[in-house]
């Protein structure tokens, strides 16, 4: 028998969802226009490229990375496309809002967008903790909060710590992971019996799940170098990225093998770890001087995400409710936290090398943003948490958590798709 | 030799439009961000605009914010300043000038406008 | 919006004298300053970055330093060609990228 969508969540979503687009709408029409300087082809084609970059890293990355569950691949793609699609729409009014509005209307450029696609890949990271066990209607609500969260953080940390695009958005990776780690926290926990092969992997959602990683591999680089603000600064965040990703591969895969009693690699470590290298090194990718460091680093970053991934799983489980597969959140915690120290220690050797005595205040600065981060991300994860425990959205029951057939139309209505 | 060079500027009738270009030589121009920055005649210097070396990022000065839309053509080599609803407060002389990176060896990039124009004058008569 | 504030607005001096020029930002920059020399009907000419880091081609006799928010510009021994306008300048993470008012530096 065939799961149906439940009939209270089919007069709330579409409603919720239509209305809010429509609200949308309505505000880019009275508050935003387009950049009318055109002035050179060759160069806004290059702009629109990075744009692009990311949006292969938000939708198809991301999008498939978080698809391996044997029950919930159909589910976990096309939420996070309708997560993106209504995430920057958001993210580029707020931050539109938040920057430029006193003066008058909202200018777009694809400046403006590229940011905007940067803080809905916040959610993305984000809801890898609580995919499968909600439905669209509260992931509307995961997403104007998080994305309000994020940019609100950001224009904080700008105005009181005095940092740039680059540095204020590389705390998306601390922040994603504990807001997503916090909203977990939140929802209801215990599998019922006879649902736990729901959340275990399959064969061919897995290899959709690598192949997500493989894009976002790809496009790392363009990730951690889209907001700098010179070449000199892009050209070293693209190179210090790519080896730090590199070796995190040869790292994931061999420590994977390292750490299972037979030798074996395991996909779930994979998924995550090729990853790490790119994780860690985003907050001082433009600074790193020489190829070695940032290849050492994405050396430790492959080691702390495979040991992650091979001991934190049942911690996580058990305090969160987080599926084994669902590593995203306490990697990109751990590997977050690491780039931020990484970033710390970059500082004092600068600040040393200088002979500017003022060490421990420039250290504190950088301490400040990051507990600031932290901070706001798990209070804004808990009020979200919170609010999608209200009956108001109708939660799938846990007997239906990571179930595709609760949300999706199958003709042939096979009950082990 | 590293050259900016003004041109553009003139009388014009308050409300009217106008618009400088700033030619760049002796230098890669399509790694630089640009400014522009203007100074009325026996008053400090004031900030005016902003552009990215691409050209995908543009900051205004809230006096100008609306009016003055500044953008680039690296092919051509050259900065625009398009300024609209010219009003008497904007006469002044107009600067561009190159933003160059000074790195810092790890925590930082520090920037300057390390090269100026000789700047051309704007009068915006009511 | 940062505004930054240049102490004193006018400084006379002799030739052979050790001058101090403040300037202080409403908030916290760091170190990203600049200070720049303006001869009448010449454009601005950079002499300091980062608050402290002369500018290729300066003298020596310049010489810069502060962080946050207090900084100042000083030349050890003024030369007949040093007699301009100075102004300091933000630049900080995000515009606007405001100028002090500047301070005339005369021959007494």
């Known amino acids: 028998m065939s799961s149906k969508y439940p009939r209270s969540v089919r007069r709330c979503l579409p409603l919720w969802a239509l209305t809010l687009e429509a609200a949308l709408i309505l505000l880019f029409y009275f508050f935003t226009h387009y950049d009318a300087s055109l002035e050179d082809q060759k160069g806004l084609v290059a702009s629109y490229q990075v744009g692009q970059d990311l949006t292969v890293m938000a939708a198809i990355g991301l999008g498939f990375l978080t698809s391996s569950f044997r029950r919930h691949s159909w589910s976990s793609v096309a939420f996070n496309l309708f997560m993106l699609a209504l995430g920057v729409q958001w993210a580029i009014l707020l931050d539109g809002f938040l920057s430029q509005f006193p003066s008058g209307k909202v200018v777009i450029t694809l400046f403006s967008i590229r940011l905007a696609t940067m803080s809905a890949l916040s959610v993305l990271i984000s809801v890898d903790a609580v995919l499968g066990k909600v439905n669209l209607a509260q992931l509307v609500v995961m997403v104007l909060v998080e994305v309000t969260a994020l940019g609100n953080l950001r224009m904080v940390i700008s105005n009181i710590f005095n940092t740039d695009y680059h540095m204020n958005m590389m705390h998306i990776y601390v922040f994603a992971a504990y807001f997503g780690l916090s909203v977990a926290w939140c929802l209801p926990k215990p599998l019922p019996e006879g649902t736990e092969d729901k959340d275990q992997t399959a064969t061919i959602p897995s290899l959709s799940a690598m192949l997500g990683a493989l894009f976002l591999w790809m496009f790392w680089p363009s990730f951690n170098s889209a907001l700098l603000r010179s070449p000199i600064e892009r050209k070293n965040a693209v190179f210090n990225t790519y080896y730090a990703v590199a070796v995190s591969v040869v790292t994931a895969i061999s420590g994977s093998s390292l750490a299972h009693p037979q030798g074996k690699i395991s996909k779930t470590y994979v998924h995550s770890a090729v990853l790490a290298g790119g994780v860690a090194v985003g907050t001082s990718c433009h600074l790193i001087p020489s190829p070695w460091l940032a290849m050492v680093l994405g050396l430790v970053a492959g080691l702390i995400s495979v040991g992650g991934a091979k001991y934190l799983p049942g911690c996580c489980n058990r305090v969160l409710g987080i599926p084994h597969s669902s590593i995203m959140g306490y990697n990109f915690s751990l590997l977050g936290l690491l780039g931020e120290i990484i970033y710390i220690v970059l500082l004092v050797l600068d600040t040393v090398g200088a002979g500017n005595g003022m060490i421990g205040f420039q250290v504190l600065l950088s301490i400040g943003e990051l507990s600031l981060a932290i901070v706001i991300a798990l209070m804004s994860g808990l009020l979200t948490g919170l609010l999608l425990n209200l009956k108001i959205w109708k939660a799938p029951h846990e007997a239906k958590y990571f179930d595709d057939q609760v949300f999706w139309k199958f003709p042939h209505l096979a009950v082990g798709f | 030799e590293v050259q900016l060079v003004e041109s553009g500027g003139g009388v014009v009738q308050s409300g009217r439009s106008l618009r400088l270009s700033c030619a760049a030589s002796?230098?890669?121009?399509?790694?630089?961000?640009m400014h522009w920055v203007r100074q009325a005649p026996g008053k400090g210097l004031e900030w005016v605009a902003f552009?990215?070396?691409?050209?995908?990022?543009?900051y205004y000065a809230d006096s100008v914010k609306g009016r003055f839309t500044i953008s680039r053509d690296n092919s051509k080599n050259t900065l625009y300043l398009q300024m609209d609803g010219l009003r008497a407060e904007d006469s002044a002389v107009y600067y561009c000038?190159?933003?160059?990176?000074?790195?810092?060896?790890?925590?930082?990039?520090?920037?300057?406008?390390?090269?100026w124009g000789q700047g051309t004058m704007v009068t915006v008569s009511s | 919006d940062i505004q930054m504030t240049q102490s004193p607005s006018f400084l006379s001096a002799s030739v052979g004298d050790r001058v101090t020029i403040t300037c202080r930002a409403s908030q916290g920059i760091r170190r990203y300053l600049a200070w720049f020399q303006q001869k009448p009907g010449k454009a601005p000419k950079l002499l300091i970055f980062?608050?402290?880091t002369l500018q290729s081609g300066v003298p020596s006799r310049f010489s810069g330093s502060g962080s946050g928010t207090e900084f100042t510009l000083t030349i050890s021994s003024l030369q007949p060609e040093d007699f301009a306008t100075y102004y300091c300048?933000?630049?900080?993470?995000?515009?606007?990228?405001?100028f002090g008012q500047g301070t005339k530096l005369e021959i007494k």
């Open positions: 002796g230098f890669t121009f399509s790694n630089n961000g």
């Open positions: 000038a190159r933003e160059e990176i000074a790195a810092r060896l790890y925590s930082r990039y520090h920037y300057a406008m390390d090269v």
């Open positions: 980062s608050a402290s």
């Open positions: 552009i990215w070396y691409d050209g995908s990022n543009k």
């Open positions: 300048q933000q630049l900080s993470s995000y515009p606007p990228y405001t």
